[in-house]
């Protein structure tokens, strides 16, 4: 038996993956334990199994088929069961009924580019992954730009409120080492969170031209 | 939908080993919960052993526990059983499973199966 505050979290990515993580208080030490997902209109069902992340909680990936496959609608609720084994019979516990369009969070985004660099500017692309079609352009993007002697968490947010899927970084310092990333989030879903932060994409500006004010 | 194919079955003696492969296409592997069955001549198709998505959990039917070992290579696309310390009556068509619900695995009617391996134990 498990004792202990327990909490169970899932989230679309849109196409057909629901990433779960479950923290538990009570220690379950070798315990085996799934997450266990009931469509209400569809006739598949899936299964993932739970592995630890860190010493109370676990995760698991509900792939639910091709990276690029739509599984789930707006009107789709999925029931998701964390079970674990007892001996050899199943006990529920956590579960919840999941609004998948409710709980968002997207793959981060991918391929960021630099397509032009000068002394004190760059512009930067980059493309969204795995993000369904029914967004249409209801979008917005978070980049974060990390200057030489600062964190990321002291880099500045920039918003982009729209599907914008490219930036143009002003003041930059001419001859200087940048790194730059991005994230995304749907505007629908009262629990949608953000994106991961894309892979870090480093650049450079270019030197100040010898015997002229930059 | 996913697609399955069994190799490595054959005549072996009785306390010999065999290792069966499962090569799996078609669809995102890591998606499956895999397992092998077996049936012999006569009988009913039967649950030998499955291993979870990410191998990390396995079960067995009591008759092959200590002997036999089911395991995946995620980056392969195959389930492995292997065989050991044969038995005669473990001769059998061997077939390998897969079931996106792990709860359903053993439930015959529920999976996705290959075409079978036979394996031969002599006495």
């Known amino acids: 038996a498990v004792n202990g505050t327990s909490q169970f979290t899932c989230f679309y990515n849109s196409r057909a993956n629901i990433s779960c993580v479950w923290s538990q208080d009570g220690a379950l030490q070798d315990t085996s334990c799934q997450v266990h997902a009931w469509p209400d209109r569809r006739r598949w069902n899936q299964t993932c199994e739970l592995l630890p992340v860190s010493q109370a909680s676990w995760a698991c990936n509900l792939i639910l088929g091709a990276p690029d496959s739509q599984k789930l609608t707006t009107v789709d609720i999925v029931t998701l069961r964390v079970l674990c084994r007892e001996g050899v019979r199943w006990r529920v516990m956590a579960i919840q009924d999941f609004k998948p369009f409710e709980n968002l969070r997207l793959m981060a985004p991918i391929s960021l580019q630099v397509v032009h660099v000068e002394t004190h500017r760059c512009n930067i692309s980059w493309e969204i992954s795995q993000a369904s079609h029914y967004f249409e352009r209801h979008l917005e993007f978070e980049a974060r730009t990390l200057s030489p002697g600062h964190t990321w968490e002291e880099a500045p947010l920039l918003t982009l409120k729209q599907k914008q899927e490219w930036i143009c970084l002003e003041t930059l310092t001419p001859d200087t080492q940048y790194e730059f990333q991005v994230r995304v989030k749907p505007l629908q879903g009262e629990f949608t969170t953000w994106s991961p932060w894309s892979q870090p994409l480093a650049f450079r500006t270019k030197p100040a031209a010898l015997g002229k004010d930059t | 939908e996913v697609q399955l194919v069994e190799s490595g079955g054959g005549l072996v003696q009785a306390g010999g080993s065999l290792r069966l492969s499962c090569a799996a296409s078609?669809?995102?592997?890591?998606?499956?919960?895999m397992a092998w069955f077996r049936q012999a001549p006569g009988k009913e198709r039967e649950f030998v052993a499955s291993v979870t998505d990410s191998g990390r959990t396995t079960d067995y039917v009591d008759s092959v526990k200590g002997r036999f070992t089911v395991s995946r290579d995620n980056a392969k696309n195959t389930v492995y059983l292997q065989m050991n310390n044969l038995k005669p009556e473990d001769t059998a068509v061997y077939y390998c499973?897969?079931?996106?619900?792990?709860?359903?695995?053993?439930?015959?009617?529920?999976?996705?199966w290959g075409q079978g391996t036979q394996v031969t134990v002599s006495p």
């Open positions: 078609g669809d995102v592997f890591v998606r499956y919960t």
């Open positions: 499973a897969a079931n996106t619900d792990y709860f359903q695995i053993k439930s015959l009617d529920r999976n996705t």
